[in-house]
């Protein structure tokens, strides 16, 4: 598992999306076999 | 019904640690950030963190990476949250809650209310 | 990290009153701000979020507004059960901040 210290980053404000991370999914895990 | 229940009152002394628990019930575990949220006595709100219950990484505010350590165990869908070190000024009730990345923190626990005194 | 500062801290106001609650953040957080209600005994409930959008179950009675740095969550014509303390939180960047709440009593 990974640690990050939640700072604020310098995304444009052009972005209309929040800079939250979005919900976990299990695409991002990888699959065994 | 989603509901987040969360472990009873701690009377602990300075300098030692706590584990409050938080168990998941009513939607799927693995589907939302668990985060984590202190109410000091004067009812402020500080967010601790938040934890992947996939991956278990973490994203933490600063002011509590030396603090906090937040675990989940999927198998019983319950998220944990340990603090060390304690001293009078962690005093305060500790809320575990659901976010939602449209919603924000849609489901709050209970509360549990952590005492540190000698 | 996103200052939030809400006012009033304080607020006395009767049944059937429209009331305003104003939040500012210290720099552009689009339209991602939320409102909780804290209730003695209850747990925190989410009000809206993103601003303006109403959680499912709200009463529509509570309506939010704002984009950027200033946002209002307005309570028309207030109930028994809305008297409790209410509190804004940005949720546009890491780490989420809160306002310092308003409690909102009767008069």
């Known amino acids: 598992s990974e640690t990050t210290t939640g700072t604020s980053s310098n995304s444009s404000q052009s972005t209309s999306n929040s800079g939250l991370a979005p919900n976990p999914t299990n695409a991002t895990t990888k699959a065994a076999g | 019904e989603v509901q987040l229940q969360q472990s009873g009152p701690e009377l602990v002394k300075p300098g030692a640690s706590v584990r409050i628990s938080c168990k998941a019930s009513?939607?799927?575990?693995?589907?939302?950030?668990m985060n984590w949220v202190k109410q000091s006595p004067e009812k402020n709100l500080e967010w601790i963190g938040e934890?992947?219950?996939?991956?278990?990484?973490?994203t933490y505010n600063q002011k509590f990476v030396a603090k906090a350590t937040l675990t989940v165990d999927r198998s019983s869908s319950t998220a944990y949250m340990q603090l060390k070190s304690l001293t009078s000024e962690d005093s305060a009730v500790y809320y575990c809650?659901?976010?939602?990345?449209?919603?924000?923190?849609?489901?709050w626990g209970q509360g549990t209310t952590l005492t540190v005194s000698s | 990290d996103v200052q939030i500062t809400q006012s009033p801290s304080y607020l006395a106001a009767s049944p059937g009153e429209t009331i305003t609650i104003n939040c500012r953040a210290s720099k552009s957080i689009s339209k991602y701000l939320a409102w909780y209600q804290e209730k003695p005994g209850k747990t925190i409930k989410l009000l809206i979020y993103a601003g303006s959008t109403l959680q499912s179950g709200i009463p529509s009675r509570f309506s939010g507004s704002g984009y950027g740095t200033d946002f209002t969550l307005t309570i028309s014509s207030l109930e028994p059960e809305d008297f409790a303390m209410y509190y804004c939180q940005q949720h546009n960047e890491y780490p989420l901040t809160f306002g310092a709440g308003t409690k909102l009593e009767l008069k």
């Open positions: 009513g939607y799927s575990f693995t589907g939302y950030y």
């Open positions: 934890i992947n219950p996939i991956t278990g990484g973490s």
């Open positions: 809650t659901r976010r939602d990345y449209d919603t924000s923190l849609d489901y």
